[in-house]
Every structure is written in C-alpha cells, then in structure tokens.
C-alpha cells in the first residue's frame, strides 16, 4: 500500500518549483488568501526577541498556518505552527507563534536571538483537503548582530570573562574541525596507499531503505494527498500510521537534495489525529 | 474572484419541497463553515443553519428543524438546503454565506440570494 | 436565544455629518475566550449584506476607516465619522457568541 503512487503531478510540480506559492483549487491564476510576512528586513542584536508578521488577507475557518526558516539549501525547515485555534511549538521552544486578536495577524517571535538564527524566514498557510491549497508569504531576512558594548551609563556591561569564554569556544571549534580534516587526510592517503584493501569492499542497503539511482538522485516521499508539511523535518523515526482507508489517494512528492528518513509517510487520517478536538466535532461554540 | 451563486429557488405549494444549491469559487470551500440566511422581502436578516467544514456537524434554528437539512459536497464545492413540508412563512430570499457561524472571525462572504415563494 | 435590539430604527443624516447606531443584547457576548462576539452588517439597496466589522472592532478589509464599532458585554455602537451618500442601506447587528446566531432589526440609515 506505501508504494502506491497517486497521479498527482501538480503537487510534485509544485512542490519541485521550491515551494513557490502553489494552489491546488478552481482558479490556478492568482493564488486565494495572499500571505504578508512584513518586516522584510529585520535587525536585532542578540538577545533581543525578533519578531514578524505574518497576514492573512482573509480568514478561513480552518487551516494551518507554519513558520518556515529557508535552509541554505533553499528547504523549508518548519518552525512553529498554528493549527485549528491551537499553537504548535516546533522543537526549539524559542520560536513562537501567537494570533492576534483580529484573527488576521500572526506574530512569529523568535526569543532572545542567536547569531545563527540570521537568515530568510517566511509564513505558509495550508487550506485543507479535499482541495488542498498552499500558499507561501515573500521571504523575509533577519540580521541578528552581535551585541555592542554599551557605554555604564545605558547598562551594565557583561563581564569580560564572557568575550573570553566565547575566544575559548572558537578556539575549541577550530581545533575539533582541523582535527577531523586531518583524520579524513589521512584516511584518503590510507586508501590511496593500499587500494586493495578497500576494492572489495561492498555496500548493502537494507530492503526498507530507499533505493538510490546515481549519485544525484532525489529521495522520494510518498505522502497521501492533503498531509502536505504537516510534521516536523526530523529523521527520527515515527511509529507505523493505522492503515488509511482504500480510497486514500497519494500524492509522491520529491523533494530534491533531500536526505531520505523512513516512516515519513503520513495518512490524512494522521492529520486528523495530530489535530486537538477539531471545532468540526464539538458543540456550536469554541475557541476564536 | 470570490463568488457564491445560489440557485433552486421556485414558488412551490404548502407542504412541497425544494433544493438549494449555493456553488463557491475563488476560494477555499471546504476551509469555511457555511450558512444559510434568509430574508422575507423588506423585512430584516434570520439565521437559518449552518453546516462547518467537515460537513458532520450541523446546527438549525427552532422554526425549521426537522423540516430542513443542510449539506455540502467539498469535492463540487457546493453547499446544500433541502427544505420539507415548506410553509407559507418560510417565504424568503435565500442567501448562502460565509462568517456567519458562532465565535467565528473567518472572512465574511455573502452570494446574491435565492428566492423561495410558499403559496398555494 | 438571544435577543439582539437596535436603534434607532431610521436616521436621516447630512453628508459629512457622523452617524451612530446602537445595539444591545439580551445577555453578554463576552466568550470564555474573553473576546465579545459582536459583528455588524450593511445591507445596500438591493444588494446582499456585507460584514463590516467582526468582535466589535476589528473592521473587514476593504472597510473604510470611518466607521468604527465599540462596547462591551451587552451594549455595542457603530458609528460612522463622516457619512456619505455611498453608506446608504439598513444596518445590523448581529450576535456570534451563542448558536442560534440572531440579528437585530435592522437600523435604515438614509442620506439627506
């Protein structure tokens, strides 16, 4: 049953375009619901909260709304997300979401910036099945610079233990990496003087790992069709999905360049499962 | 271009009964709860039911439960009224819409309306 | 259910001149959730009605920013600073916080 593929090249086409806007519904010429994601710049020093905004033109009653950090490998890595009137934190606690009163307007915070939390960050909203719809915002950069010493006046300054505790580290970094570039030196002289030893060396993967073509080739994720992105990019292993009705239809998304984790197959039904009491179940009133 | 189109509506004796349709575009259907709201001509707005997304959880005001049902179909993006044992104060135009649903902040969209005429 | 009451029932006001319309609910609109679900609609002639405002103050896009809504638990106001003769119609009042959704009666606002 994994192994079915659905015809669903739209998806995989879109998705192959690099997650440029995409939706799937009546009229494929201008995208429903177009996404802000405003500053488009944004400075802060380290430590201070960044934060963006994320805009729905117009609000549906049910949809999913993610916090995307562009990889420098042009993937989303999903942050946060907001589902049915519920937050949900991504792994890293420090990345939040929070909507707004008018329900239109999402804050993306990121708490007490790092300097490798730099980079283009982006919101994406996914109206859902059975015409399942994605839309992206513009991309948005953040610059987190490193904190300026201050003048006694202002605040305090940090203690000057703590410039020599980040010299440390460096140092630290550099010698672990001129470590390991030396190892894999050696290991290549190793292999360059007794070929022999390696020749008959032979590699064999598992029957559940996927099957690569070349060197380039792309690994391939079936999804059903309407879990697009719902989970987080994490290779850890997943328990088995409950088996998804027959009429499930899939959707093979490949995505380029990516590493390939097993279990990443999710069913609709999963989508339902990952969702608290969706408003659809409960009485005539819930949460705004 | 976001558009409600509803039809169905027909002059129809006491007691008979109707479908309405409301066919959406332009937008995401099945990401709305819908509503059905009508109006007795030059006389003010009265909720009818609505139906949320899935499609299983339905509500309807005291003066037509049990006679009407409403429904949708995703996959058409249509929504659905079938009204039973009609009678003469069930005379309206009837209006599909959007945003019109308890503690919902979702856009409001409203079609032109379709009109139903009891009398025998 | 909840009985939504507007008034006045017509008003007749200049061009550039401000408009207020009243509406109260026989009980609170305020929600657990602690926002009060209170929309208002504008019906033009002839035409369907049209969402203004949503929880009381947050206006729909497209919505000029001459009108603008307020209150709290069962007493809410819209009000438009500067009418004109395009903000002819009936306006309502409608209640969000409790199934069944009610409306009030409706307000005619007409341009002098």
């Known amino acids: 049953m994994g192994s079915r593929r659905g015809p669903w090249p739209l998806v995989w086409a879109v998705l192959q375009l690099g997650w440029w806007p995409g939706w799937l519904l009546d009229s494929p010429d201008r995208p429903w619901s177009p996404l802000t994601f405003s500053p488009a710049q944004l400075t802060v020093q380290e430590g201070e909260n960044a934060t963006f905004t994320c805009s729905l033109a117009d609000i549906p009653d049910s949809f999913v709304l993610n916090w995307y950090r562009l990889s420098p490998r042009n993937q989303t890595d999903k942050l946060a997300a907001f589902q049915e009137d519920r937050i949900e934190p991504g792994r890293d606690r420090r990345f939040r979401v929070t909507r707004l009163p008018n329900g239109r307007d999402f804050h993306m915070s990121i708490v007490a910036a790092r300097l490798n939390d730099s980079g283009i960050y982006l919101c994406g909203a996914i109206y859902l099945p059975p015409n399942t719809q994605i839309n992206e915002s513009p991309r948005a950069e953040l610059s987190v610079t490193e904190r300026t010493l201050e003048p006694p006046t202002q605040s305090p300054s940090p203690p000057p233990r703590l410039s020599g505790q980040l010299q440390g580290l460096v140092i630290g970094v550099t010698s672990v990496l001129v470590g390991v570039l030396l190892l894999l030196l050696l290991t290549w002289v190793l292999a360059a003087v007794f070929p022999r030893a390696t020749r008959g060396a032979c590699v064999c993967g598992s029957e559940d790992e996927p099957l690569k073509e070349g060197p380039d080739a792309a690994p391939v994720f079936t999804l059903d069709y309407g879990e697009l992105d719902f989970q987080w990019r994490e290779k850890t292993p997943e328990p088995p999905a409950p088996c998804a009705p027959e009429q499930t239809e899939y959707a093979t998304i490949v995505f380029p360049g990516r590493p390939a984790s097993p279990g990443r197959r999710a069913s609709a039904s999963s989508l339902q499962g990952a969702q608290p009491p969706s408003p659809e179940d409960g009485p005539g009133l819930w949460p705004p | 271009q976001v558009q409600l189109v509803e039809s169905g509506g027909d002059l129809v004796k006491p007691g008979g009964s109707l479908r309405l349709s409301c066919v959406a575009s332009?937008?995401?259907?099945?990401?709305?709860?819908m509503t059905w709201v009508r109006q007795v001509p030059g006389m003010g707005l009265q909720w009818v039911a609505y139906?949320?997304?899935?499609?299983?959880?339905?509500s309807y005001a005291d003066a037509v439960k049990g006679r009407f049902t409403i429904s949708r179909d995703n996959a058409k993006n249509t929504l659905y009224l079938h009204m039973n044992s009609l009678r003469a104060e069930d005379t309206a135009l009837y209006y599909c819409a959007t945003g019109v649903v308890p503690t919902t902040v979702a856009s409001s969209y409203w079609g032109q309306g379709t009109l139903v005429t009891v009398s025998s | 259910d909840i009985v939504m009451t507007q008034t006045p029932l017509s008003l007749s006001v200049s061009p550039g001149e401000p408009a207020s319309i009243s509406c109260k609910a026989s009980q609170s609109l305020l929600h657990s959730s602690g926002y009060t679900y209170l929309y208002w609609f504008r019906q033009k002639p002839g035409q369907s009605p049209q969402r203004l405002v949503y929880k009381v103050v947050y206006r729909d896009p497209g919505v000029p920013d001459r009108f603008s809504g307020s209150g709290s638990g069962t007493d809410f106001t819209l009000r438009i600073s500067r009418v004109e003769a395009d903000d002819a119609g009936v306006y309502y009042c409608?209640?969000?916080?409790?199934?069944?959704?009610?409306f009030g009666q409706g307000t005619k606002l007409e341009i002098k």
């Open positions: 409608g209640q969000g916080i409790k199934d069944p959704f009610t």
């Open positions: 139906v949320k997304t899935g499609g299983s959880s339905t």
């Open positions: 332009g937008f995401p259907f099945s990401s709305f709860h």
